[in-house]
């Protein structure tokens, strides 16, 4: 169940700019768009921090300000789609532009679509800056075509 | 399977509370929001507001601030609405939905409320 | 606040005849609209989610279509236990709002 997700399975790769945070996916005979047999629905969303500066520590997961950002952002998405729903978030990337973050969420294929995961998003914008200190703008949402990206770390158990 | 099971009728006065029980099972009742939704007789659908069990997080429909409080009783999987200062404008019947966030699959079977002199 | 509008508020059909029920939203709501059937002194039953998803347990007369502002469901062959209020409902928006709801009665 969603709360059993705070303990992400974490991954780094410190030859690049991404962290995977993979808790474990269940499967489900829900369907909905995109989806894959194994019944998981996956939407990448980007959004900037304005408050923040990029710099190269956001370059190297193995950083205290790559950590506590991440953990934030983490534990941020766990509160806002904390819902039978959501299963985890993963391949958490930073960029540059104030601080630029892209990621991919993981939900039971059926039970939300790309402009309810934006529209919840946005209804924690006032929250996420006054418990987290994040200030968010240009939030984007999309869904993750079909076949998922071996690359982006967000493995689903056959 | 999953099942909501509400508390009998209401008959109340104007100017008074009342409490309604949607007791849960069949589903990890922490997990899922909890939804309430208003029928007036013969009207349509209001969404009232939902918590979420598991820490007590809770939205509301603006209009319904202050009018109605969600709870939630972890132990005993029921989720509770408290309906305050009745007017005859309250009158009508009070459904528990469980879905996801943004949407219901399951309902319970309603409380009529009357506000009666 | 979404605004949702259904028409007619009665429709009046014929059992076999197929019958569509409309939802528009005061603004761009993507797919994000779900359909709920309600009989006399019942529960809302859920029938369509996100705009044309089918649920189990729910007939495959049942379909929707639309995005954006414009929404329909559709029975292809309607039968006397359909006889019910249907309401479309929103969640692209907060508050989540539902339409006024169309009564569907036999001739």
């Known amino acids: 169940t969603p709360t059993t997700l705070a303990s992400h399975s974490t991954k780094t790769d410190a030859s690049s700019t991404h962290h995977s945070s993979v808790p474990p996916l269940t499967s489900s005979n829900h369907s909905t768009s995109p989806q894959l047999s194994t019944g998981v629905s996956f939407f990448f969303l980007s959004f900037h921090i304005s408050n923040l500066q990029f710099n190269s520590s956001l370059e190297d997961p193995s950083t205290d300000y790559y950590q506590e950002l991440q953990r934030d952002i983490s534990e941020m998405f766990l509160q806002i789609y904390k819902q039978g729903g959501f299963l985890g978030l993963s391949n958490i990337k930073f960029r540059p532009g104030s601080v630029v973050v892209q990621l991919t969420l993981a939900f039971r294929e059926g039970t939300i679509n790309v402009h309810d995961v934006e529209t919840q998003f946005n209804q924690y914008k006032t929250e996420a800056a006054s418990r987290y200190n994040l200030t968010i703008s240009d939030v984007s949402v999309s869904d993750v075509p079909f076949p998922f990206s071996a690359q982006s770390g967000a493995g689903v158990p056959g | 399977q999953v099942h909501l099971q509400q508390s009998g009728a209401e008959l109340v006065r104007p100017g008074s509370s009342v409490k309604i029980s949607c007791k849960a099972s069949?589903?990890?009742?922490?997990?899922?929001?909890m939804n309430w939704v208003k029928q007036r007789p013969g009207q349509g659908l209001e969404w009232i507001g939902q918590?979420?069990?598991?820490?007590?997080?809770?939205n509301y429909n603006g209009k319904f601030k202050g009018k109605a409080t969600l709870t939630a009783d972890k132990s005993s999987s029921t989720a509770y609405m408290q309906l305050s200062s009745l007017t005859s404008e309250d009158s009508g019947i009070y459904f528990c939905?469980?879905?996801?966030?943004?949407?219901?699959?399951?309902w319970g079977q309603g409380t009529l409320v009357t506000v009666s002199e | 606040d979404v605004l949702l509008t259904q028409s007619p508020a009665i429709l009046s059909v014929s059992p076999g005849e197929r019958v569509s029920f409309s939802c528009r939203a005061s603004?761009?709501?993507?797919?994000?609209i779900h359909w709920y059937q309600q009989s006399t002194n019942g529960s809302p039953r859920l029938i369509i989610k996100y705009a044309s998803e089918s649920l189990s347990g729910i007939p495959s007369r049942f379909s929707g279509s639309g995005s954006g502002t414009d929404f329909t469901l559709t029975i292809n062959s309607v039968e006397s236990e359909d006889i019910a209020d249907y309401y479309c409902?929103?969640?692209?928006?907060?508050?989540?709002?539902f339409g006024g709801g169309t009564k569907l009665e036999l001739k």
């Open positions: 409902q929103q969640s692209n928006g907060w508050p989540l709002t």
């Open positions: 918590i979420y069990p598991g820490d007590g997080d809770t």
């Open positions: 069949g589903y990890e009742f922490n997990s899922f929001w």
């Open positions: 603004q761009n709501i993507g797919t994000s």
């Open positions: 939905a469980r879905g996801y966030k943004a949407w219901f699959i399951y």
